[in-house]
């Protein structure tokens, strides 16, 4: 059980308040984090509260600004980069964000020899992404999706791809279902370890047909956005990936890098690229049918020109159970010999694991292992590896650090940061210095956040960079909700399960219950952080329990449970949420009559089936931005879970699972349905069909529309919505408002 | 057009070294790499290693590793094989041959040859 | 390392007749993109001369009489009608893996 820790003693009570539903949206308690922009072993920058980019040294204890927020503000810039030889650094400015990751915007170099901007030669605007060669200050960017290259920044810039166009020909950066469902990045360019290289992808989104949806604006006529998208089953875009010679680019220009045969014979993906040395590079493919990744690693041969990617280096991962991987496929850390590497996949036993690899998958070494997962190697050095793991006490929702030393045999385990402060912090994330001769953790909970330097070598914790006082002094008048994880057996399976509980929880009483569920595969919800949110707010001000519980397709918890959801999606999701509101109901402090379920993208597509279950376990519920089809939606990730929409594969199910099939089911709940209209993830047709099925079934419902907004619902949206969901709920749980 | 020229004839005892040399004329010297190839008296050819003007990247066959030593001079577009430790199995002809732009291994041009005896 | 088979070891033929040369690598030396397998004339006293890169690809100032074919592991030089000239010695070499290799050699001579 996880209690926040209590400061409600009678004398104070009166001085208590509960949280509001304005703080949560005015974002008052909200806590900061401390990532070191690590330059060197012992270096880092960090940009101070008034906006100078400031330089540490940890061994000297010293720090000086290496550029004032009067430079910054001369072109208001936002963020900044230094090239690694410290002699320029970039500002960015005139940020315009796109989808997720991508954003374009104005880039300005400045140079710190003689304090003033680089004249001539500058750079095009907007940039779709710019960054420095890991040594010296080269420049590659991307402007209207072509790539060029700068020896320095004054110098005029060499064009290394002339094909690219909007939306058909993408050079350096993803195209749409690149970037949110296989790259996770804004870029599809990576520099060699040197700089001797540049390698990059090439994306071709011809034949991909497109998806069209107004943006209304404030002019006479709404303007239309076309993205090419790829629904399931769709065409594809046509990846290649090509390297460059950044010393002489012109000599023999890009070479492409061969695909495996056995990947090149069908639609296949790229799915990332990772250099071991300035002449070695390792790429990543998967077939279209996601269940074989082939590692390919890859030679430069000086007397070819070109790479050489031989059958010996190729090694072969493949799920017989699900899907390769789990959400993306795990990337390789190589080890200091440049051949050999680590690699999290499943063991024998169905759970994410460390293997050393040294010639071929077959022959991999297990460096961990047990009824928990590895969740991320961090760093490997000559003498340890740092990664991260659930298996602290058995709760799946933490997260440690741990060293194994690989230096010695046999090798050591030790968590580093399981007995810090353990009541505080259960939930770690940690950022390396360059040989990780330091490296900041960051805690996120369940207690207050905090963030601090330790010593690479004994782990000694070196200092607080960043605690969070004001919001612990912000937080002592607040009444807040105590949080519990526990878990339930049902069946063979285990469903964990976080339970929000209001200040004066009394078992004696009766509350009413919302379910929170995303639901996704390879996700969780119920993890040991820190949250001052909307639900929080619910539980504290409006007496709610709130439940979040991760069923079977969720993550960290072996095999067995993450790919029962495989080629089924929306049917043991569903029915797992279903079997822990029972379970919550035999606790005997819920309110029966008052049950919602409440989620947003996956999670609004789960509480719409939920909601239809015809259970009637549920009175109301709320779906944002829902999935209502699977043919609606992207690709590359529904096809991972889904299969095909064919005949011969999986169409039957993908049929079976929308939830208009189960319109007729929403006529006994109260259903609030939310969508962006101009949303490019989860596209508005979604909610649009919905509507369309609930409108011909004769089913009342409620529904809301946000204009021009995307899936995320920002800006002001996010109040509307907030409060438009809170007046529903109250609603539906009688509350008084 | 393009020329590889090299030196004249050697004899050489047992145990001794000999150092070949190869000038390019007519192209960029930095650009293409230079392989080194031998063909004892009546028999096929051997591949020896090659050496990159421009980069300095030297390939060595296994199995003359530790007794060859490639180099080039820039200044004078010359290349240099020296072989150490000679034995009379070493008795061949030695050829620079210049790797083609576009062959990937290929190689274009080739000097005349030095025949190097090693006798005692 | 890659080891080249040629045959025939001596092949007698009349000029204005077609030769067929083979060349056999013990593994294959073709990537999805390119045949690593060159050919070379070498005749007495001389260097030897490049006549086919990447397994079929001319080399600039050679008689389009020469060809090259095949991939994986067997390749076929072909001289489509033999000039006195083309009486010599010839070589297959690889570039696919170190150390480069070079066949034994296919001795053309007049019959």
């Known amino acids: 059980i996880v209690l926040r820790p209590s400061r409600v003693h009678n004398s104070e009570e009166n001085t208590m308040r509960a949280l509001t539903l304005k703080d949560i949206l005015n974002g008052t308690f909200s806590y900061k984090t401390f990532f070191p922009n690590w330059i060197s072993g012992q270096e880092y920058l960090h940009q101070s509260a008034d906006n100078n980019i400031v330089l540490y040294n940890i061994e000297t204890g010293q720090s000086y600004t290496i550029l004032s927020n009067r430079t910054m503000k001369s072109v208001n810039a936002s963020n900044y980069g230094l090239s690694p030889d410290r002699q320029f650094v970039y500002l960015e400015s005139d940020y315009s964000k796109l989808w997720r990751y991508s954003y374009t915007a104005t880039y300005y170099i400045y140079d710190l020899s003689n304090g003033e901007f680089v004249r001539g030669n500058e750079l095009p605007r907007p940039i779709q992404y710019l960054c420095w060669s890991p040594v010296g200050s080269k420049l590659a960017y991307v402007y209207q999706n072509n790539i060029y290259l700068k020896q320095r920044p004054g110098d005029p810039p060499f064009q290394i791809t002339f094909n690219g166009r909007e939306n058909k020909i993408f050079n350096g950066i993803p195209d749409w279902v690149y970037e949110e469902e296989m790259l996770a990045t804004k870029y599809a360019l990576w520099w060699s370890p040197n700089g001797k290289f540049l390698a990059y992808a090439e994306f071709n989104d011809t034949d991909i047909p497109v998806i069209a949806y107004s943006y209304y604006g404030d002019e006479q006529y709404p303007r239309t956005i076309n993205i090419p998208y790829p629904k399931a089953g769709a065409k594809n875009p046509v990846v290649r990936i090509f390297i460059i010679d950044t010393t002489y680019p012109a000599y023999v220009g890009p070479q492409e890098v061969p695909v495996p045969a056995m990947i090149a014979s069908s639609d296949y993906y790229f799915s990332w690229l990772t250099w071991v040395t300035d002449e070695r590079v390792c790429l990543q493919w998967l077939k279209r049918v996601q269940n074989v990744s082939v590692l390919s690693i890859c030679d430069f041969r000086e007397d070819w020109q070109t790479w050489d990617c031989p059958k010996t280096q190729e090694h072969i991962e493949e799920s017989r159970t699900g899907w390769a991987g789990g959400f993306f496929v795990s990337t390789p850390v190589f080890s200091y010999d440049a051949i050999s590497y680590y690699k999290i996949f499943s063991d024998k036993d169905g759970y994410k694991h460390i293997h050393y690899i040294k010639d071929t998958v077959e022959n991999a070494i297990q460096i961990t292992s047990g009824k928990w997962e590895a969740i991320n190697i961090f760093r490997v050095t000559q003498d340890s590896l740092f990664y991260s793991s659930n298996e602290f006490e058995e709760y799946p929702g933490r997260r440690n650090i741990y060293r194994i030393s690989i230096g010695s045999y046999p090798p050591s385990k030790k968590c580093v940061t399981c007995h810090l402060r353990k009541e505080r912090c259960q939930y770690y994330t940690a950022s390396f210095s360059d040989y990780a001769k330091y490296y900041a953790l960051v805690c996120y909970g369940p207690g207050i956040p905090i963030s601090t330097l330790h010593d690479g070598r004994t782990d000694q914790e070196i200092k607080i960079l960043e605690e969070n006082k004001e919001l612990e002094n912000a937080l002592k008048n607040i009444q807040l909700p105590k949080e519990e994880i526990k878990k339930l057996e049902v069946d063979e399976i285990t469903l964990w399960y976080k339970m929000i509980l209001p200040p004066q929880f009394d078992r004696s009483k009766k509350y009413p219950l919302l379910i929170q569920v995303y639901g996704g595969p390879c996700s969780q919800s119920v993890r040991s952080v820190f949250a001052v949110n909307w639900i929080s707010y619910l539980a504290s001000k409006e007496g709610m329990v709130i439940a979040l519980v991760d069923g079977r397709g969720t993550a960290f918890q072996g095999d067995k449970l993450l790919y029962a959801v495989y080629r089924k999606l929306g049917v043991y999701e569903v029915e797992d949420q279903i079997t822990a509101v029972r379970k919550f109901i035999e606790m005997g402090f819920i309110d029966e009559k008052r049950i919602a379920i409440w989620g947003w993208s996956y999670g609004g597509y789960v509480s719409s089936l939920a909601l239809a279950s015809g259970t009637g376990l549920f009175k109301c519920g709320i779906a944002v931005a829902p999935v209502s089809s699977w043919e609606y939606y992207a690709s590359v990730y529904t096809e991972r879970f889904m299969g095909l929409p064919t005949k011969d594969d999986n169409l039957e199910h993908y049929k079976n699972s929308t939830v208009m099939a189960r319109a007729e089911y929403f006529r006994n709940v109260d259903y609030l349905l939310i969508h962006g209209t101009a949303d490019d993830n989860v596209h508005f047709q979604n909610s649009a069909q919905i509507a369309k099925a609930l409108v011909n079934a004769q089913v009342d419902f409620q529904a809301m529309w946000y204009s021009d907004q995307n899936h995320g619902l920002s800006g002001l949206s996010t109040n509307h919505l907030y409060t438009h969901m809170t007046h529903f709920l109250k609603q539906c749980f009688s509350l008084s408002d | 057009q393009v020329q590889l020229v090299q030196s004249g004839a050697e004899v050489k005892k047992p145990g001794a070294s000999v150092k070949v040399s190869c000038k390019a004329s007519g192209y960029t010297f930095t650009e293409n790499i230079i392989h080194w190839v031998r063909q004892a008296p009546g028999q096929g050819l051997e591949w020896m290693g090659w050496i990159h003007p421009g980069s300095g990247s030297i390939k060595y066959a296994q199995k003359l590793q530790g007794r060859v030593t490639m180099t080039t001079d820039t200044s004078t577009s010359t290349a240099y094989m020296e072989l150490r430790s000679l034995r009379s199995d070493d008795t061949a002809v030695y050829y620079c041959?210049?790797?083609?732009?576009?062959?990937?291994?290929?190689?274009?041009?080739w000097g005349q040859g030095t025949l190097v005896t090693v006798s005692s | 390392e890659i080891v080249l088979t040629q045959s025939p070891g001596t092949l007698s033929l009349s000029p204005g007749e077609r030769a067929t040369l083979s060349c056999r690598a013990s593994q294959s030396v073709s990537t999805s993109a390119y045949s690593y397998m060159h050919w070379y004339q070498q005749k007495p006293g001389q260097a030897p001369r490049l006549l086919i890169y990447g397994a079929s690809n001319l080399e600039s100032g050679i008689p389009d009489r020469f060809s090259g074919s095949g991939s994986g592991t067997d390749f076929t030089l072909t001289i489509s009608r033999l000039e006195p000239e083309d009486f010599a010695v010839y070589y297959c070499q690889q570039s696919r893996e170190y150390p480069y290799t070079f066949g034994q050699g296919t001795k053309l001579e007049i019959k």
């Open positions: 041959a210049r790797h083609g732009g576009t062959g990937r291994g290929a190689m274009d041009y």
